[in-house]
Interface confidence: low
């Protein structure tokens, strides 16, 4: 009897959706996988007879649940399916955005990157999929714990009047309203304002 | 539909234990992870612990703040993973979900989320 694989999840991030699993313990030899998706009732092969222990599915309609598939083989022997269901609209990770920061006196100036889809067209972002898009900003005082939050209404922001010759750190996330869904954060940004360059009167 | 009921919360003194129940209904493989999140008041929901099964004994996995302390278990033939919390802090108090396909514990992605218990950990 072969054994079915182990610890079988979807990594979905950002519409990039591997199965993946673990190989289980067999004594008679290397074991080899197949993974399928329910299409129109019917099962269909997306990994046949694979070594690996991921199969990628990023191909899947990002809408509806999807019922996928994977087994252990050996020779003319093979284990139990083991399935799960994915809905990649709602169960994907939202990725960090990508983030611009420059300093202007005593000012940061923000632009923000919604993060790319795997297999869709060069300019396709998580933004073109979710109607509500928006972005949430953090930024603190480097060494400090204290953060601010804020969420900018388009796609760049200034952080005005800050402390003069101070670090400030920022990170950027999305988040989706209608869904009360948020995103990884973006790695934190530091940079030094300069001078205050408001003229004394 | 999977459905996911956790039980098991309550108030508790700091350094005191806690076991978190959470049944899982519909369909669930034994093969796929099945764990904890938590959410406390103002923050950010957190991963806590996953499982899996394992023809080899049981593949956990558990954030830093916790690990020594929490257990995570599981029992297939009763569609049930449990979390066995030692040594509680105040920091513990939130309230705990169960979901399904949570093994990247550092995003709150997953598949299927329970309604939550609340744990409160008081000093």
């Known amino acids: 009897m072969v054994p079915p694989p182990e610890n079988v999840r979807m990594n979905s991030v950002n519409f990039k959706n591997i199965l993946q699993w673990e190989s289980p313990a067999f004594a008679k030899g290397n074991l080899t996988f197949t993974a399928q998706y329910l299409s129109y009732r019917i099962f269909q092969d997306k990994c046949m007879n694979t070594t690996l222990t991921e199969c990628d599915f990023s191909s899947l309609s990002k809408y509806g649940d999807h019922t996928l598939r994977v087994r252990a083989e050996f020779a003319d022997e093979h284990s139990d399916w083991v399935n799960i269901t994915f809905c990649p609209v709602d169960d994907t990770i939202i990725g960090p955005p990508g983030m611009q920061v420059e300093v202007l006196a005593d000012s940061l100036h923000m632009r923000f990157l919604a993060p790319k889809i795997e297999n869709e067209y060069e300019t396709w972002t998580m933004k073109n999929v979710y109607n509500s898009w928006t972005y949430n900003v953090q930024y603190w005082k480097n060494g400090t714990d204290e953060k601010f939050q804020i969420t900018p209404q388009y796609d760049f922001e200034v952080l005005r009047n800050l402390e003069p010759w101070t670090t400030y750190c920022v990170q950027v996330r999305g988040f989706l309203p209608d869904r009360n869904k948020a995103g990884e954060w973006s790695e934190p940004v530091c940079e030094q304002t300069t001078h205050d360059e408001t003229v004394p009167s | 539909q999977v459905q996911l009921v956790e039980s098991g919360g309550g108030l508790v003194q700091s350094g005191g234990s806690l076991r978190l129940s959470c049944v899982a209904s519909g369909f669930t493989s034994p093969y796929s992870t099945i764990g904890w999140f938590r959410q406390a008041p103002g923050k950010e929901r957190e991963g806590v612990a996953c499982?899996?099964?394992?023809?080899?004994?049981?593949?956990?996995n558990y954030i830093d703040s916790v690990r020594g302390r929490f257990t995570i278990s599981r029992d297939n033939a009763k569609n049930t993973v449990y979390l066995q919390m030692n040594k509680l802090k105040p920091d513990d108090t939130a309230i705990y979900y169960c979901a399904t396909n949570c093994w990247r514990l550092t995003s709150p992605a997953a598949d299927n989320w329970g309604q939550g218990t609340q744990v409160t950990v008081s000093s």
């Open positions: 499982i899996s099964s394992s023809g080899r004994g049981v593949n956990a």
